[in-house]
């Protein structure tokens, strides 16, 4: 039967009807006290008072209400939930993922895990109702746990009419015995001891480093991974793991040449709740890829929205080269990763300057041919975008990757609604689209515009009637990805380039395909 | 530090395909790049791979009869030239690349003869 | 292709004394990333090539400091401070703007 809940759009818990809870008011000591009314959360500040015992993890302060039991945990940076018991800054799981307790919450699948605070999971042998479910990890969240001891991480998903188990794909920590690292690398233990300009690291309890904090001799040397060797390390919170240097007989440090372990493609998707002309608005953790490119111009004050863009490391977006062709100056040029609403600030976006561009040189500006271009963030070290949940790289895909036709991708952008729209889309929107066969993609299906072998077509197969909103891209999405899943990860095959019309029945999109271009990328990646 | 291991030396008849192995440790991240020498001569580019994604690229002198692969799981680069000739008997290096080709393997002899 | 032209083909040189080799390239090796992918190499008789200086003038790991690289453009330079009798071999320069990667036909460096 179907149920009133409310969600509560500051902490994503869910809530039944006429259900009440307290929560902290963010950056204020007042506490709210919520009930759920026909849908809608309806709050007002409370008098509160400390505990008069500990009930928060993580180093949370508890506050109880003055005139009734509920109690409520002010967590520190990086906790979360009713305990703060969820570590927010857990970008993977160790061993069987027995204590995860971070934000993860995606299936293999690609399917949004269910709350574990759900009503449909009160039979379930394992739901956020448990005694012990504070103890699990379980509770008024959709997080990826392991409360069973099963293999890894797993979640119950909504699948062909009902709640069934499935594994998340949440990374593992250590991947076998590839020797990489996670997050900024503080868990590293690998054994990689070069630097990145190829220099050999320093023994950490080299005789030359007395003086220094960081040594075989510091107190906390063991639990920071310090010892009697020269493995790249990260022990006070950098960027990235590093190591003591001599440089010309001068004692220095430097970052280290260890791989970050790839969590490329992996993101946690939320089905899109609102439909829109062209396809559906979206959150940005959905596609935390999808990069927005301002620029300023020489005759006109402030940034306009140019072009979206794709993540594909730290410090590298690619996009259309079409996009470029005004020739801006790289310090006019301004990419921010993790926004939702293309003009507001998002509470986690990240702004980067453009340190320079490089647009294919056959780039062909009546065809679109070789519409591919790069752009290196500025950064002061060799990191620019920090993971996060709404700022993660895509996979770049194989050279041999060939999906089937009619595969179903999607792609995203700030892009207009409709082709004759004089406006952009205010919101991130997401498009699914099918691939068309190379024998679909041709000049005769497109007005007799030049199809090249490096372009590809995709579009909306579904049939309809004149008001069909078919979905596609549009002007302002251009430079954005095409996505389709492959071997569990969002894979890049596509980059936005042209179209006729957006949203027309049996007229595809054309997309840069970016398997011609593997070694172009990496080439002009290089450092 | 990146170790490249190689396969052994080779006899081929004119005509026929060499496939030679580069088995590599360390960060297996980088392009692997293919170099020959003629005895007493100078080093010749042939092409590159990428490890990760497979991506290759090719000296036009070479497009046609050589073909770089990798398998993953074993960290193992592969070049198979065909169509072999007198003149391509060299002793074939791998090196890996990263801001340049940092590390050598030791070679393996290639000699073409009837 | 990018032809680069080393000279001189053969260099006897006395332990202790400079020594310089010169690498011309037949057009920019600038790369369209802004990098100059100019590096030297060193081939000891019997051995792999060693990789001595990349990009123009950084030193690699573990190369004595005795070794220098410079130039731009179009023309770059390999010295060596004080030559030591382990420096012996033949240098070549090597380009990876520009596919395909070339190398220049290499000088001798020997004792006199």
């Known amino acids: 039967s179907y149920q009133v809940i409310c969600r509560d759009e500051k902490t994503q818990m869910i809530y039944q009807q006429h259900q009440s809870w307290l929560r902290p008011v963010l950056r204020s000591n007042r506490v709210e006290y919520c009930w759920c009314n026909s849908g809608r959360a309806q709050c007002h500040s409370v008098p509160v008072k400390s505990c008069s015992e500990p009930r928060c993890f993580n180093g949370g302060t508890c506050q109880q209400a003055l005139y009734f039991s509920d109690f409520v945990c002010q967590c520190p940076e990086g906790f979360a939930g009713k305990c703060c018991e969820i570590d927010t800054r857990a970008t993977c799981y160790e061993d069987q993922g027995i204590s995860y307790r971070g934000t993860w919450s995606t299936a293999e699948s690609g399917a949004e895990c269910t709350n574990w605070n759900s009503s449909a999971l009160a039979q379930k042998p394992y739901s956020g109702r448990r005694p012990d479910a504070i103890r699990l990890g379980l509770g008024n969240h959709n997080y990826c746990r392991n409360p069973d001891r099963d293999s890894k991480p797993w979640c119950y998903v909504f699948k062909a009419g009902k709640y069934s188990s499935e594994f998340c794909s949440t990374p593992a920590c250590s991947e076998g015995n590839s020797d990489c690292y996670f997050g900024n690398g503080s868990a590293y233990r690998g054994t990689h001891s070069l630097t990145e300009s190829g220099a050999s690291c320093l023994p950490w309890n080299s005789m030359i480093l007395i003086g220094k904090v960081y040594t075989a001799q510091n107190p906390s040397a063991q639990a920071l991974g310090l010892g009697k060797h020269n493995y790249c390390r990260n022990p006070d919170g950098d960027a990235k793991p590093w190591c003591h240097v001599l440089k010309n007989r001068r004692l220095t440090w430097e970052y280290c040449d260890v791989p970050s372990c790839s969590t490329c493609g992996l993101r946690q998707y939320s089905q899109p709740q609102f439909r829109i002309k062209g396809g559906l608005f979206a959150d940005i953790a959905s596609h935390p890829w999808q990069a927005a490119i301002f620029a300023k111009h020489r005759r006109s004050p402030g940034e306009r929205f140019l072009c979206g863009g794709i993540l594909i490391s730290s410090c590298w977006i690619l996009s259309a080269a079409h996009c470029f062709q005004e020739r801006f100056p790289p310090h006019h040029l301004t990419v921010i990763l993790g926004r939702t609403y293309r003009v507001v600030p998002g509470e986690e976006e990240q702004k980067f300057e453009v340190e320079k561009y490089i647009v294919h040189k056959e780039f062909d500006d009546d065809t679109y041919d070789n519409d591919i271009a790069l752009l290196q963030l500025k950064s002061d070290s060799s990191r620019c975008a920090q993971e996060s949940s709404v700022v993660r790289t895509v996979c770049l895909p194989p050279a041999d990757l060939q999906l089937p036709d009619w595969t179903e991708c999607e792609l995203s952008g700030y892009g207009k609604h409709e082709a004759l729209s004089p406006f952009y889309s205010e919101r991130l929107k997401e498009a699914h689209v099918r691939l068309y066969p190379s024998s679909r993609c041709t000049s005769q299906h497109l007005l007799n515009r030049t199809v090249t072998d490096n372009m590809l077509c995709a579009g909306d197969t579904r049939s309809g009637g004149p008001q069909a909103n078919l979905h596609d891209a549009c002007q302002g999405d251009s430079g954005g990805p095409l996505v389709c899943l492959n071997d569990g990860r969002m894979t890049l095959v596509g980059i936005i380039s042209w179209g006729l019309g957006c949203g027309q029945k049996d007229v595809p999109g054309v997309y840069t395909k970016v398997t011609n271009y593997l070694d172009w990328i990496r080439d002009n990646m290089r450092p | 530090q990146v170790q490249l291991v190689q396969s052994g030396a080779e006899v081929k008849k004119p005509g026929a395909s060499v496939k030679v192995s580069c088995k590599a440790s360390?960060?297996?991240?980088?392009?692997i790049n293919w170099v020959r020498q003629a005895t007493g001569q100078g080093l010749e580019w042939m092409g590159r791979i990428d490890p990760g994604g497979g991506s290759t690229g090719y000296a036009q002198k070479f497009q046609g009869r050589v073909t770089m692969t990798r398998n993953t799981s074993i960290s193992t680069a592969y070049m198979e030239l065909s169509s072999l000739r007198s003149e391509d008997t060299a002793v074939y290096y791998c090196?890996?690349?990263?801001?340049?080709?940092?590390?050598w393997g030791q070679g393996t002899l290639v000699t073409v003869s009837s | 292709d990018v032809v680069m032209t080393q000279s001189p083909l053969s260099l006897p040189v006395t332990p202790g004394e400079p020594a310089s080799i010169s690498c011309r390239s037949s057009?920019?090796?600038?790369?369209?990333?802004?990098?100059?992918?100019l590096d030297w190499y060193l081939q000891k008789p019997g051995q792999s090539p060693q990789l001595l200086i990349y990009k123009v003038s950084n030193r690699a790991s573990g190369v004595p400091d005795r070794f220098s690289g410079s130039g731009s453009g179009t023309d770059f330079t390999l010295k060596i401070s004080r030559v030591e009798a382990e420096d012996v071999g033949v240098y070549y320069c090597f380009q990876g703007s520009h596919v395909p990667w070339t190398f220049g036909g290499g000088t001798k460096v020997e004792i006199k």
């Open positions: 090196a890996s690349y990263y801001y340049a080709m940092a590390y």
């Open positions: 360390g960060n297996t991240s980088y392009w």
């Open positions: 057009q920019s090796i600038v790369h369209s990333n802004g990098n100059t992918y």
